[in-house]
Interface confidence: low
Amino acid sequence: DSPWTNISGSCKGRCFELQEAGPPDCRCDNLCKSYTSCCHDFDELCLKTARGWECTKDRCGEVRNEENACHCSEDCLARGDCCTNYQVVCKGESHWVDDDCEEIKAAECPAGFVRPPLIIFSVDGFRASYMKKGSKVMPNIEKLRSCGTHSPYMRPVYPTKTFPNLYTLATGLYPESHGIVGNSMYDPVFDATFHLRGREKFNHRWWGGQPLWITATKQGVKAGTFFWSVVIPHERRILTILQWLTLPDHERPSVYAFYSEQPDFSGHKYGPFGPEMTNPLREIDKIVGQLMDGLKQLKLHRCVNVIFVGDHGMEDVTCDRTEFLSNYLTNVDDITLVPGTLGRIRSKFSNNAKYDPKAIIANLTCKKPDQHFKPYLKQHLPKRLHYANNRRIEDIHLLVERRWHVARKPLDVYKKPSGKCFFQGDHGFDNKVNSMQTVFVGYGSTFKYKTKVPPFENIELYNVMCDLLGLKPAPNNGTHGSLNHLLRTNTFRPTMPEEVTRPNYPGIMYLQSDFDLGCTCDDKVEPKNKLDELNKRLHTKGSTEERHLLYGRPAVLYRTRYDILYHTDFESGYSEIFLMPLWTSYTVSKQAEVSSVPDHLTSCVRPDVRVSPSFSQNCLAYKNDKQMSYGFLFPPYLSSSPEAKYDAFLVTNMVPMYPAFKRVWNYFQRVLVKKYASERNGVNVISGPIFDYDYDGLHDTEDKIKQYVEGSSIPVPTHYYSIITSCLDFTQPADKCDGPLSVSSFILPHRPDNEESCNSSEDESKWVEELMKMHTARVRDIEHLTSLDFFRKTSRSYPEILTLKTYLHTYESEI
């Protein structure tokens, strides 16, 4: 017991009080057990279980006995402590689950309810596919799903572990932003370790951001406590929430959370496909039924909003499928590994001068043909994971293949005496993997009736919960408004961000002779008067904007200088600061042909007479640096005519590219763009550079870039992006789409080698597409990394566009 707490006080009349008593007084709230600060009689008075959690016919009208867990006496309704099935068993009412679905047009709440309360019913390890078990196993959950708003699945954040995800649900922040980067983590500044089972987790210093209960409290909205000590039975948690709902107006919270450790506990033990999983799922459903019957008994079933949500899924994993680092490294005793479904490596000794992350990565990269993990420096992880920008994330990260584990050495893996594993399921893998997806259902007056919505990410829920409670969200990683389609009425109406820098529209300003690029093609142009003709074309806007910017010109959301450059086949927003386009947009029809590039054009570029020589790149920089080459944002292979091909070789279409990366980029441009255009009846492509040297997921300022690329006149991008848009209905061509849009985006790491792909020595057709799928991304990720705003001019509503921007194409099979 804590020396500060006098536990001799009593919990009489104080069970599950909402105000946490401070030392030296003992506590009676639902977390006092975790803090070992409960009053001596907490168990006796607050955790009663006598006669169980249900009324039976013989209990109806019983004489009140205060020892009972819940009551079936005539006065229990008035006193707000009936068992949840009292009216069903004793008064002939129907169970909530047996009533028909009803559309709740407006919340019907008893007197004094200022807003519909929100109950967040969170379940640990609820894999999305469990919902397929349907009403035979989970009738209550199935009714919530079919009568309310649901998605086929909800995407957790990486790593797909409990603490990072529960806290993301509460804050709308990625783990790198809120600080809970794992169930276990080491903070080098605190020189302390956070564990699920240790006391350190109670220290506020680990928890960043603003969780929903604080947002609510700061804005004068009462919040019930969100956490439950594991010893408190689920039924008691439900009864407590129901009792809180009967409190006087000035005491009653508006938001409540329930948490179930199941089905995670059973999922680990039996695996997600074990027949033993049926019972824990029935148990959870029974608790949902108790909640809904209890709400109906209080006449709150058409008042409250209920969110039924999981933290992550569950995969079939056993200890027989474990990769041991001792098979790759000689010095595993010098490292600390956070093991399991992901690996995080740091030196065992602080300030170890010999510890070399790059050397360790070299020893772990592509060493075995059947290797089941891939090592990354954290800044090289796919940007969609948002898992780098925190000192608690170790420099070396191992992405582990689904169904596998990683450990330091065989001795680190515990087995039963029989040699069998202690577990058959686990989670933590890449958050786009099917088995890691979890459940979302919204039910109540504010959610739409009988509505299925596309999958979305759990970072988006904090904003929705704020909307449900009439709160202004704290800054977070969600895109407010992107889930407006879940709600019957929207209190928040998103607005497009203001364009900060408007572009210049330069005409032909300079002479051919003004330029000395050091690699010009113009001496190859025959006849010579054709040169003037080619340059004059650059002044012609024509209908390029309508053809190549199908969704409006991207807006630049920071102060800079850039030019709009029109061409027959593409359009660019050319940066006078970075000496390359911020974006290049082009539309490729289904019929487009891929043509070859004449030899004489393959190693030279043309000056662009619209842009000052001082704002143009110079080939000398590339000639002097053998490690660097250049590529083109608009692919010359897709030029519509021999004349138009010359536009593709303008210096203003040129970007610095490592030779290794050019293999990826050229295959994408030459093969994949055409493939997508054929499959999707044409596509619009917007590509450009990304600068994220400090790996914070945000656009680097000019000054920040200068810190990292000293002495180079041309800043080298850390990544290149591409946004590929078509009509969702492939019968309509991309440029004549009047229905919803379909988008797939990529953020490709710009690296001097292709070692991420172990078979990169083979033909590009064998590995490039896989690499791109690994680095799939949301448009929103690209917007943050570029400070650009896309899709500004469409016939679709702005919330619909935000939904599109937050979509992630996972390339996974159906759930």
Epitope: D99, A106, E108
Partner: antibody
Framework: EVQLVQSGAEVKKPGESLKISCKGS????????IGWVRQMPGKGLEWMGI????????RYSPSFQGQVTISADKSISTAYLQWSSLKASDTAMYYC?????????WGQGTLVTVSS | EIVLTQSPATLSLSPGERATLSCRAS??????LAWYQQKPGQAPRLLIY???NRATGIPARFSGSGSGTDFTLTISSLEPEDFAVYYC?????????FGQGTKVEIK
Amino acid sequence: EVQLVQSGAEVKKPGESLKISCKGSGYSFTSYWIGWVRQMPGKGLEWMGIIYPGDSDTRYSPSFQGQVTISADKSISTAYLQWSSLKASDTAMYYCARPYGTFDYWGQGTLVTVSS
Amino acid sequence: EIVLTQSPATLSLSPGERATLSCRASQSVADSLAWYQQKPGQAPRLLIYKASNRATGIPARFSGSGSGTDFTLTISSLEPEDFAVYYCQQSNGWPRTFGQGTKVEIK
């Protein structure tokens, strides 16, 4: 379809008692609140009170507390508004409506005239 | 109790004109506000609920806006059948209350 049908017009003398009714159909009567609204001649709408027929839970506006009684008989899906002693100032049109957050369904109204 | 004040009391307009009716609450009602139309001898009809949502079957010329204490009902182009009395009603505080009404009459 949801319907609320009210009893016919009434002419009464001051001091007399009266009970008017509102019969609900086309929905689960016991699980929706029913409200009563008064409209005096040439005046606006006034919210009187509400009842949940499932368990007869009743709420009144302070202005009408003790002046009227709201009740319901769930066996015949009917809600009632009654006066034990009418006054001339009770002359008005009375509407029943469902539910009470937003009144999306209304009865046709019952005109009560109290005159000596 | 929450008092709702509607303005103006009377609005004289011609068919085809735009009507803007205001409803102000004595304290915040969030977005829990409805608008009704009542014609002589008829029961009120729900037009807008939750401040800005059109009820089933209500023409698009009716729109609601606002939250907190200030709300507006707009009829973009008056039709002959729109001349009536309009009431706002809050469902945020107890007791539920109505505004005193705005009469929209033909000029």
